[in-house]
Interface confidence: low
């Protein structure tokens, strides 16, 4: 809040001339502006300048009792109406009022443009008491004024719930032109027209604009602010700025670079993050964008195989994030991968190509001719099969997985066995008698487990029955044979 230093001065006689502490600055005094207060003007005579009528913002005090006379209306005295000064100068202005001593309590506040000044300003109120009236001078000082100090200042006095408002004092800070809009950096298409805008204000006005391109003036005659420069087109990068001139001098805007859009540089550092049998996850570092945002990228994939036809697979993807999972690849295959990205101008060259490989896949076919029969003397089930015809991409066979499910009255139990790749037969112990055993076999490579063969069922009788007839599935068929012994 403003510190209101109530300096109790020595008794000070009322004086015929101006009050002490009156304005001392480089100012221009103008006629008073119209009153802005809600108070009705009333005819009054200033106690310090008898006989001079003044129509101001006044408060007419009430009659204190039936027999007392009407007290003279109160109003702030005239002061300077307009102060013009240069930036960074100091200024001090005041308002004064003489208040009959009947009024025991007053407060004075300063307001600017309708808002009370509560900040760290220098506001001092001085009191000069006499037998009948007290002269009050409220001073306001600003050191090193800035443009933001421009505005209309008033004093407000509260007295017995009445409010008295002074005439406004207009402060006008003049200085070098101040930019309200400066040219902005742009990325433009070659040989295409574009506009640059520059706007600066005073006071003092007018403000005139000169445009500068690469340190040379563009316009011989100045343009009044605001100014729009239309550039018909550029073939190479240029730097533009504007100069704003007024009576106080010249201000130069920031220099802005106008870039010419071009195709992007190729991406760099294409890297493999993860490979599976049928996909490769890659990332890349985008090249320079050519002053135009990347729109999308293209991942180009060539199979590195003398027998392949050399065709290129193209996968389009968004420009960000700089990653892509290439899918639908062959297992156990070598690929050459490159990345290109585009902006509105066109496509970049392709990045340096990198080599990548997919891992081996799982088998695509099941073992053939699965045969199951009961060896009751050993309480075993014998299983035989033929090795599947796997493709090279499925990788090397590492073994087989045998699923056998045992089902009897309301109970079902699945067990899994793993056997080596050299086997084409296996024996499993009978788990339950008087039950059905269902057998399925899948081939296994490092790439995973292939599909299971069609189920083959065999019935395991109670102890004492003898039968060695096998259950089997023929090589090409999808039958689901059941042999009950």
């Amino acid at each position: 809040a403003i510190t209101e230093a109530r300096e109790e001065a020595k008794p000070y006689p009322l004086f015929p001339g101006p009050l002490p502490g009156s304005l001392q600055t480089d100012h221009t005094s103008l006629l008073s502006l119209p009153h802005t207060s809600g108070y009705q003007p009333a005819l009054m005579f200033s106690p310090t300048q008898p006989g001079r009528p003044y129509t101001g913002n006044v408060a007419i005090p009430r009659v204190t009792s039936a027999g007392s006379k009407l007290l003279p209306p109160l109003a702030f005295k005239h002061t300077v109406g307009h102060i013009i000064l240069s930036e960074h100068k100091d200024v001090k202005f005041n308002c004064s009022i003489s208040v009959p001593n009947i009024y025991q309590d007053t407060t004075i506040s300063w307001w600017k443009d309708g808002k009370e000044l509560l900040g760290a300003h220098h506001a001092i109120t001085q009191f000069y008491p006499d037998d009948e009236v007290t002269a009050i001078i409220a001073s306001f000082s600003i050191t090193s004024v800035q443009r933001s100090d421009n505005g209309s200042y008033i004093c407000k006095m509260k007295i017995n719930n009445e409010e008295i408002v002074s005439d406004p004092i207009y402060i006008e800070v003049q200085g070098l032109p101040h930019f309200t809009k400066q040219p902005e950096s742009m990325n433009v298409t070659r040989n295409t027209a574009f506009n640059l805008t520059c706007q600066a204000v005073g006071p003092p006005e007018p403000v005139n604009i000169f445009w500068v391109q690469n340190s040379s003036r563009v316009n011989e005659q100045p343009e009044k602010s605001p100014s729009v420069l239309t550039v018909p087109g550029l073939t190479e990068m240029a730097v533009f700025s504007c100069e704003a001139h007024n009576d106080k001098g010249l201000t130069v805007s920031k220099g802005v670079q106008i870039n010419i859009k071009a195709i992007p540089s190729p991406p760099t550092e294409v890297s493999i993050h993860n490979s599976t049998a049928h996909s490769i996850l890659i990332s890349w570092v985008p090249g320079f964008d050519g002053y135009s945002p990347f729109r999308n990228c293209s991942v180009q994939v060539k199979e590195v195989d003398p027998l392949s036809n050399g065709s290129v697979m193209i996968f389009n993807t968004s420009a960000s994030p700089h990653m892509y999972q290439i899918k639908q690849l062959q297992a156990l295959a070598n690929y050459s991968i490159g990345v290109s990205c585009m902006n509105e101008i066109g496509w970049s060259a392709v990045s340096p190509w990198i080599l990548a490989s997919t891992t081996e896949g799982a088998p695509s076919v099941a073992p053939l001719n699965v045969t199951v029969f009961l060896n009751e003397s050993r309480d075993n089930v014998d299983i035989r099969w033929m090795k599947p015809l796997t493709k090279r991409q499925a990788g090397e066979l590492v073994g087989y997985r045998i699923s056998h499910v045992w089902q009897s009255a309301g109970i079902s139990k699945e067990l899994l066995e793993e056997v080596g790749q050299n086997n084409s037969r296996a024996q499993i112990s009978v788990q339950v008698h008087n039950a059905t055993c269902t057998v399925r076999i899948a081939a296994v490579t490092k790439g995973g487990v292939g599909p299971f063969s069609d189920p083959v069922k065999i019935f395991i009788p109670a102890h004492g029955w003898v039968d060695h007839a096998p259950s089997s599935t023929p090589a090409p068929g999808n039958a689901d044979p059941v042999l009950i012994i």
């Epitope: 550092e269 890297s271 993050h273 570092v285 994030p321």
Partner: antibody, heavy 120, light 107 residues
Framework: LIQLVQSGPELKKPGETVKISCKAS????????MNWVKQDPGKGLKWMGW????????TYADDFKGRFVFSMETSASAAFLQINNLKNEDTATYFC?????????????WGQGTTLTVSS | DIVMTQSPKFMSTSVGDRVSITCKAS??????VAWYKKKPGQSPKALIN???NRHTGVPDRFTGSGSGTDFTLTISNVQSEDLADYFC?????????FGGGTKLEIK
């Protein structure tokens, strides 16, 4: 199985030299750069720099220029951190950490850390 | 140097909860942020790289997100084995810099 196994804890006197090793296994050593990270007792992690395991070229963070030397031995698939003229403030746990991929600078596997105590 | 401000420093949670840890970079690091987990006496383990890429073998309960300057590691359905220190790393500019770490405690 990718592993970085660091040498055991060290107790040294100020002014001495220490050499910490980081032995890599389970991958091609020269395909991944090796970073070194310092963790002061009860504090956060500080990146010291890295060594290009293909060229042997080291890069040091500003705070680790001078007394710190990164080296390697390709045949042993090992990286080394040597600290000369030890000071008390070198007391810390030092980690080696493998660079994930060329294009990005993150680490994907770390050593278990080597605790260095410098005390007179 | 790029400063990575990680919060919170400590976090207490219960099994089954969802928690989020954030790292704020002092300048734009695109998506070059990695997250790590460190248990006492063990080496740090990679969780996330490039802001959102899960490292091999990391459960999908761990999710990374963010770009530019703000990054988050979210652990959904917290398990007892998640008790650890977590820290972020910006790997956009040298020198690489780490967040101060978050200690996750299980109630």
């Amino acid at each position: 199985l990718i592993q970085l196994v660091q040498s055991g804890p060290e107790l040294k006197k100020p002014g001495e030299t220490v050499k910490i090793s980081c032995k890599a296994s389970g991958y091609t050593f020269t395909n991944h750069g090796m970073n070194w990270v310092k963790q002061d007792p009860g504090k956060g992690l500080k990146w010291m720099g890295w060594i290009n395991t293909y060229t042997g070229e080291p890069t040091y963070a500003d705070d680790f220029k001078g007394r710190f030397v990164f080296s390697m031995e390709t045949s042993a698939s090992a990286a080394f951190l040597q600290i000369n003229n030890l000071k008390n403030e070198d007391t810390a746990t030092y980690f080696c950490a493998r660079k994930g991929v060329t294009a990005a600078r993150y680490f994907d596997y770390w050593g278990q850390g080597t605790t260095l105590t410098v005390s007179s | 140097d790029i400063v990575m401000t990680q919060s919170p420093k400590f976090m207490s949670t219960s099994v089954g909860d969802r928690v989020s840890i954030t790292c704020k970079a002092s300048q734009n690091v695109r998506t070059a942020v990695a997250w790590y987990k460190k248990k006492p006496g063990q080496s740090p383990k990679a969780l996330i790289n490039l802001a959102s890429n899960r490292h091999t073998g990391v459960p999908d309960r761990f999710t990374g997100s963010g770009s530019g300057t703000d990054f988050t590691l979210t652990i959904s359905n917290v398990q007892s084995e998640d008790l650890a220190d977590y820290f972020c790393l910006q790997h956009w500019n040298y020198p690489l810099t780490f967040g101060g770490g978050t200690k996750l405690e299980i109630k």
